[in-house]
């Protein structure tokens, strides 16, 4: 890093510097290097860009090893191809008011960076760019089939049936993902769905995954120990392959399933995770599908008729999905 040793330059000729970065001789007068820019670390060998009025500020005379490229007092700024004098203010766009100060540009947002939390009046808030407006504004996504306007119907809205549990705020979008619905089948391969706006356009979309609460062929009741009424998570002795429309999972899985009760209770998944499963079909085609994997089950008396989709969604949602 210092100039005491002999000159050693990279084998290739002069380096190619990014646009606007000067090609200069290093501080030892040995090799041509790309000049360090404002705020970057500099050394004796890695000099700052002299064409921009920058110098290597080592902070204290004792420290002469590594400094920071700093602009001389009153140095101008180059921003978006325009030169601004020190102390000059300018609007870089309708969204930002900027000021040049000693070679450094600082900008303040002109648009509100406010956050909007969900409420009965606006369950799925997101920021959008409206035509003719500079700043993005909050809009509230209404579910497609909501015909009556007003929070008094909050309990019956689609997104509330699925139960939005917003947890994350991304740039201009309150990311919300609902809990997974109950599996559409009590045994065998079924479908579980959820609603999310966790996508590039912040639009509500429906996601689905395969699910199997328990195999249909398993006779689980005979495994219930004497004196017990339930077997919550029966042990599956051997790894299994999943089947889907004539296609078979490429890998074998030692999956957990939910058990049964003899006292009228039903056992459903409580904690789940979602993983991709590859299926190979007889024609050689391989397809990848997301599938629910059970971590824990719970036994309870909320056992609505399986054909009542809304009731089953309400009572038997998947909680605590890890994916």
């Amino acid at each position: 890093q210092n100039c005491s040793g002999p000159c050693r330059c990279p084998a290739e000729q002069a380096p190619r510097c990014p646009a606007g970065v000067s090609l200069v001789l290093d501080g030892c007068g040995c090799c041509r290097v790309c000049a360090k820019q404002l705020g970057e670390l500099c050394t004796e060998r890695d000099p700052c860009d002299p064409h921009k009025g920058l110098f290597c500020d080592f902070g204290s005379p004792a420290n002469r090893k590594i400094g920071v490229c700093t602009a001389k007092d009153g140095a101008p700024c180059i921003f978006g191809g325009t030169v601004y004098r020190s102390g000059e203010s300018f609007q870089s766009s309708c969204k930002y008011q900027c000021t040049c100060l000693d070679g450094a540009v600082g900008c303040m947002p002109l648009c509100s960076m406010d956050v909007r939390l969900p409420s009965p009046d606006c369950p799925f808030p997101r920021r959008v760019k409206l035509p003719g407006k500079c700043c993005e504004e909050w809009v509230c996504d209404e579910p497609k089939d909501q015909t009556v306007v007003g929070p008094a119907l909050a309990a019956y809205r689609l997104e509330d049936t699925f139960g939005p549990d917003p947890t994350m705020i991304r740039a201009n979008c309150l990311v919300q993902t609902t809990e997974w619905s109950a599996c559409s089948k009590t045994c065998g391969m079924g479908i579980s769905t959820r609603v999310t706006n966790d996508n590039a356009s912040c639009r509500l979309e429906k996601q689905s995954r395969l699910c199997m609460v328990r195999p249909c062929e398993a006779d689980l009741e005979e495994n219930i120990k004497k004196g017990k009424k339930c077997i919550r998570t029966p042990k599956i002795s051997k790894p299994i392959k999943f089947e889907l429309s004539g296609c078979t999972s490429v890998k074998t899985y030692r999956a957990k399933f939910c058990g049964v009760c003899t006292d009228g209770r039903c056992c459903t998944p409580h904690r789940t995770t979602t993983l991709p499963v590859e299926f190979k079909c007889p024609d050689g085609e391989v397809m990848k599908k997301n599938m629910m994997f059970i971590k824990t089950c719970a036994c309870h008396y909320n056992c609505p008729g399986d054909n009542d989709i809304f009731e089953s969604l309400y009572y038997r949602k998947m909680y605590g999905d890890m994916a």
């Epitope: 509100s112 406010d114 956050v115 909007r116 939390l117 969900p118 409420s119 009965p120 009046d121 606006c122 369950p123 808030p125 504004e137 909050w138 509230c140 306007v149 007003g150 929070p151 008094a152 119907l153 909050a154 309990a155 809205r157 509330d160 139960g163 939005p164 549990d165 917003p166 947890t167 609902t178």
Partner: antibody, heavy 114, light 110 residues
Framework: EVTLKESGPVLVKPTETLTLTCTVS????????VHWIRQPPGKGLEWLGV???????DYNAAFMSRLTISKDTSKSQVVFTMTNMDPVDTATYYC????????WGQGTTVTVSS | ESVVTQPPSVSGAPGQRVTISCRSS?????????ANWVQQLPGTAFKGLIG???NRAPGVPDRFSGSKSGTSASLAITGLQAEDEADYYC?????????FGGGTKLTVLG
Amino acid sequence: EVTLKESGPVLVKPTETLTLTCTVSGFSLSTFGVHWIRQPPGKGLEWLGVIWRRGGTDYNAAFMSRLTISKDTSKSQVVFTMTNMDPVDTATYYCARDGGFDYWGQGTTVTVSS
Amino acid sequence: ESVVTQPPSVSGAPGQRVTISCRSSIGAVTTSNYANWVQQLPGTAFKGLIGGTSNRAPGVPDRFSGSKSGTSASLAITGLQAEDEADYYCALWYSTHYVFGGGTKLTVLG
């Protein structure tokens, strides 16, 4: 910066009507609703009502017959009216922004006394 | 009996984790209740902490978190600090109206 400020009389007589105004800045009343909440001396909070972003209202059933909330979006003002005031209505009255009650006014203390 | 109940007081030492519960006597707390938590510091106005069950309001440190389970919503505060000493209120939405809990006084010991 988001701010809400309540204004109105500090003293009203029993049977009179209380009118409070909540003036907001930093957000639009067409984007956010505004709630009214009160806190009697030494007690907890009581939700009174709300005017939603689209102008609809919901009220606490206990005050339904006495309460009216309206707004003038262009003036960024919400007006709260409570009729037939009683000494038990003595409290600090607050307006708060919808969406997690994230921003509140500083409150205005109203005493009902003859 | 109140529809929404909170413990009157909770306490904890600096650095500890405390939770404040908000119980609905009507049934399970769901996302349709849009559980909210607000803080009232001594002698000052109110400040929203959590909205929509688990979303922090602007400027609220991530030491504060909201959740729900069964018939309760909860506010958890980790790494307790002296300035957290305040009254905390929850509010639950019931289709046409909000109901506030009675409030919980948090005391930071020591």
